[in-house]
Interface confidence: medium
């Protein structure tokens, strides 16, 4: 037997109490999938966090970072301090990259120079806290 | 026991105005979310506008933005809709809704009342 349930679109819910009539989705939830029998509470972009898409009665809300910021995570599940680059964000903030290392985004840890004598090769432009070194013949 | 009680519903030609009351008891309209939703002849249920949260923020559907007002009066334990420049789309049963949060982070409508019934005709 089929579940009337199963008729509901998405943007409603099943509603038990009400002979499973499908019932809009109250403002500020959504249900992106047909037979629900709740709707999902929307996320609130709020704070450090800035809504990037507005909820619908189909779809959840997106949000993204404040300028000075960038996301993290899946679906942008945190913000994170941006840094200047030859930068690193450490508990104490934002922190110069150390001698032989370098950082050319706002985000991301400092990393260490190439070591051009690996590959049997010469500086040819040295490294600064921006920019990594650049190896030569 | 929660009980939603609708009025103020009746014929009116387009254009016109109309103030449906919801009166509540079982609970404190100013310390939930509340709204109107409506179903016309041979249609689904429709959510007309809410009043949300202690700071009373309001949301309308697209469909009668500009021309329904929602209010409440906390004294009165009562929820109001202002109906304005109404037209013969909006002829249906209104219903008074009371949201309902559930533990895995739904929502659902509370629909207690039996509505009242809004008629634009000439």
């Known amino acids: 037997l089929q579940d009337p349930c199963s008729n509901c679109p998405a943007g409603t819910f099943c509603d038990n109490n009400r002979n499973q009539i499908c019932s809009p989705c109250p403002p500020n939830s959504f249900s992106s999938a047909g037979g629900q029998r709740t709707c999902d509470i929307c996320r609130q972009c709020k704070g450090v966090f800035r809504t990037r898409k507005e909820c619908s009665s189909t779809s959840n809300a997106e949000c993204d970072c404040t300028p000075g910021f960038h996301c993290l995570g899946a679906g942008c599940s945190m913000c994170e301090q941006d840094c200047k680059q030859g930068q690193e964000l450490t508990k104490k903030g934002c922190k110069d990259c150390c001698f032989g290392t370098f950082n050319d985004q706002k985000r991301g840890i400092c990393r260490p120079w190439t070591n051009c004598s690996l590959d049997g090769k010469s500086v040819l432009v040295n490294g600064t806290k921006e920019r990594d070194v650049v190896c030569g013949p | 026991e929660v009980q939603l009680l609708e009025s103020g519903g009746g014929l009116v030609q387009p254009g016109g105005s109309l103030r449906l009351s919801c009166a509540a008891s079982?609970?404190?309209?100013?310390?939930?979310?509340v709204g109107w939703v409506r179903q016309a002849p041979g249609k689904g249920l429709e959510w007309v506008s809410a009043?949300?949260?202690?700071?009373?923020?309001?949301y309308y559907a697209e469909s009668v933005k500009g021309r329904f007002t929602i209010s409440r009066d906390n004294a009165k334990n009562t929820l109001y809709l202002q109906m304005s420049s109404l037209r013969a789309e909006d002829t249906a049963v209104y219903y008074c809704?009371?949201?309902?949060?559930?533990?895995?982070?739904?929502?659902?409508?509370?629909?207690r009342g039996q509505g009242t019934q809004v008629t634009v005709s000439s």
């Open positions: 079982g609970f404190t309209i100013s310390a939930e979310d």
């Open positions: 809704a009371r949201y309902v949060y559930h533990a895995g982070g739904g929502v659902t409508f509370d629909l």
């Open positions: 009043i949300l949260d202690s700071g009373g923020s309001t």
